[in-house]
């Protein structure tokens, strides 16, 4: 889980090694702050849980792409 040491900077120290279906993902944000030890992606799930993930992993990139497309598509 993400850790906010000195708000407002949130850092990830460990990544999930389990793939998570895009069905469970609601949004994401990238962590690129130099105050953090590593770049990360934080996914927010449909039940508002936050999960740290490795942006180098293919499933993470695919999930971000999927969420980007969802955001761009207007609801009918």
């Amino acid at each position: 889980q993400p850790d906010a040491i000195n708000a407002p900077v949130t850092c990830c120290y460990n990544f999930t090694n389990r793939k998570i279906s895009v069905q469970r993902l609601a949004s994401y944000r990238r962590i690129t702050s130099s105050k953090c030890p590593k770049e990360a992606v934080i996914f927010k799930t449909i039940v508002a849980k936050e999960i740290c993930a490795d942006p180098k992993q293919k499933w993470v990139q695919d999930s971000m792409d999927h969420l980007d497309k969802q955001t761009q598509t207007p609801k009918t």
Partner: antibody
Framework: QVQLVQSGAEVKKPGASVKVSCKVS????????MHWVRQAPGKGLEWMGG????????IHAQKFQGRVIMTEDTSTDTAYMELSSLRSEDTAVYYC?????????????WGQGTLVTVSS | DIVMTQSPDSLAVSLGERATINCKSS????????????LVWYQQKPGQPPKLLIY???TRESGVPDRFSGSGSGTDFTLTISSLQAEDVAVYYC?????????FGQGTKVEIK
């Protein structure tokens, strides 16, 4: 394509423990979130527990708390479910199950089942 | 935990006729942001593990015949077999996957009349 192959049938005495294995092929176990579901004879499906990446840990149904241990051997891609203090009502087919597309909360891939009979 | 209740417990339908199974959740399993319902249907034949038929309440899994359809939203859902075939004799289960723990309905047994 994920394949799950479970260990064979077991007969146990009340009070004993049973350990059921589930061997994963086609994926590595660490990519998957393995869950366990049981089914008593002529009854419905009952979720026992499994790895929940949203909580970052293995979670169990309340009724099995303290009696079930779910473990993984990543070197052999094998998941295990150990149930202790067995009673006759634990007689059931035990399934391992997962979602090969990543953790969704439902299961599109199931093991063949392991029948555990508890009888004195 | 979300409680799932199916009805009826069993039904007998003539070959070629329609079979309808209902599933009700104790709270809404609709995620409003994507307008998706987090409900699946499984089919289980004797001596076999369950087989996933439908996810997101109405999306058929690959390879599932189009006589199977799912509908409903919020708390009330239906699985319909439009024209029952002999191979459809089985027990059908709904399951919610909106929140943890995942919970199943008690099952509906479908037989031929």
């Amino acid at each position: 394509q994920v394949q799950l192959v479970q260990s064979g049938a077991e007969v146990k005495k009340p009070g004993a423990s049973v350990k059921v294995s589930c061997k994963v092929s086609g994926y590595t176990l660490t990519e998957l979130s393995m869950h366990w579901v049981r089914q008593a004879p002529g009854k419905g499906l009952e979720w026992m527990g499994g790895f929940d990446p949203e909580n970052g840990e293995t979670i169990h149904a309340q009724k099995f708390q303290g009696r079930v241990i779910m473990t993984e051997d990543t070197s052999t891609d094998t998941a295990y479910m150990e149930l202790s203090s067995l009673r006759s009502e634990d007689t059931a087919v035990y399934y391992c199950a997962t979602d090969q597309g990543g953790y969704s909360g439902y299961f599109d891939c199931w093991g063949q089942g392991t029948l555990v009979t508890v009888s004195s | 935990d979300i409680v799932m209740t199916q009805s009826p417990d069993s039904l007998a339908v003539s070959l070629g006729e329609r079979a309808t199974i209902n599933c009700k959740s104790s709270q809404s399993i609709l995620y409003s942001s994507n307008n998706k319902n987090y409900l699946v249907w499984y089919q289980q034949k004797p001596g076999q593990p369950p087989k996933l038929l439908i996810y997101w309440a109405s999306t058929r899994e690959s390879g599932v015949p189009d006589r199977f359809s799912g509908s409903g939203s919020g708390t009330d859902f239906t699985l319909t077999i439009s024209s029952l075939q002999a191979e459809d004799v089985a027990v059908y289960y709904c399951q919610q996957y909106y929140s943890s723990p995942p919970t199943f309905g008690q099952g509906t047994k479908v037989e031929i009349k």
